[in-house]
Interface confidence: medium
């Protein structure tokens, strides 16, 4: 559906609401809700980030 349409999502889509802001919106992502600690490596570290860390926002 076109942006702003009220058509329901396609069948089988996850029941979690889509929290992405509308196109062009300046609303920031939902910060502070991640359950992961700050997993960015220490400065100067060559270690890779921890496995599967997708919920910790990297704001660098």
């Amino acid at each position: 559906p076109a942006p702003g349409s009220t058509a329901p999502p396609a069948h089988g889509v996850t029941s979690a609401p889509d929290t992405r802001p509308a196109p062009g919106s300046t609303a920031p992502p939902a910060h502070g809700v991640t359950s992961a600690p700050d997993t960015r490596p220490a400065p100067g570290s060559t270690a890779p980030p921890a496995h599967g860390v997708t919920s910790a926002p990297d704001t660098r």
């Epitope: 920031p28 700050d38 960015r40 921890a50 496995h51 704001t59």
Partner: antibody, heavy 117, light 110 residues
């Protein structure tokens, strides 16, 4: 060279208040979540509080034992993190450390808090 | 309350490989617990060794490595040195708070 320097500890009576400070250098402080951890002979190491980034609206989390009594805050312009401690109890006695970065890479030397009458 | 359990004491010899473990009372430790390992030397000198289960902090010798072994987090020192004698703490993340273990006193007989 990364450094974390705590200050503000001392002797306080039960029910009293105290504010600890930690100044960081050697890394981009504003990019990293910071924690306070305390150590006592009775409880060993105990995580106290965490503060996230400006982009996280400076979200905070606390250990159950200090919720409602302690407040963590930060001033990125001063590369500093603080711990305001109110209604102190004898069991809050210990050495308090600020620590952080991926996730406890760096530690200060600690500042001692003694709660006693 | 969640309890994180470590061996109270271990003894090794220089050049040997020793593994310290960290168990959670909630069940298996996973990468979502972001296991950390911290070393304490005399006079309350703390140094972070491992973050996020297996990431070495800057300047930490390669002989220190973090992993998951079975249902526990583990710190392995491959080729222990006398200067590795210290107390080692693990910390586990539980959604919005950390819990530290009681520490393992490692003795390196020289």
């Amino acid at each position: 060279q990364v450094q974390l320097q705590e200050s503000g500890g001392g002797l306080v009576q039960p029910g009293g208040s105290m504010k600890l400070s930690c100044v960081a250098s050697g890394f981009t402080f504003s990019n990293y979540w910071m924690n306070w951890v305390r150590q006592s002979p009775e409880k060993g190491l105990e995580w106290v509080a965490e503060i996230r980034l400006k982009s996280n609206n400076y979200a905070t989390h606390y250990a159950e034992s200090v919720k409602g009594r302690f407040t963590i805050s930060r001033d990125d312009s001063k590369s500093s993190v603080y711990l305001q401690m109110n209604n102190l109890r004898a069991e809050d006695t210990g050495i308090y450390y600020c620590t952080g970065v991926g996730q406890f890479a760096y530690w200060g030397q600690g500042t001692t808090v003694t709660v006693s009458s | 309350d969640i309890v994180v359990t470590q061996e109270s004491a271990l003894t090794t010899s220089p050049g040997e490989t020793v593994t310290l473990t960290c168990r959670s009372s909630t069940g298996a430790v996973t990468t979502s617990n972001y296991a950390n390992w911290v070393q304490e030397k005399p006079d309350h000198l703390f140094t972070g060794l491992i973050g996020g289960t297996n990431n070495r902090a800057p300047g930490v010798p390669a002989r220190f490595s973090g992993s998951l072994i079975g249902d526990k987090a583990a710190l392995t020192i491959t080729g222990a040195q006398t200067e590795d004698e210290a107390i080692y703490f693990c910390a586990l993340w539980y959604s919005n708070h950390w819990v530290f273990g009681g520490g393992t006193k490692l003795t390196v007989l020289g």
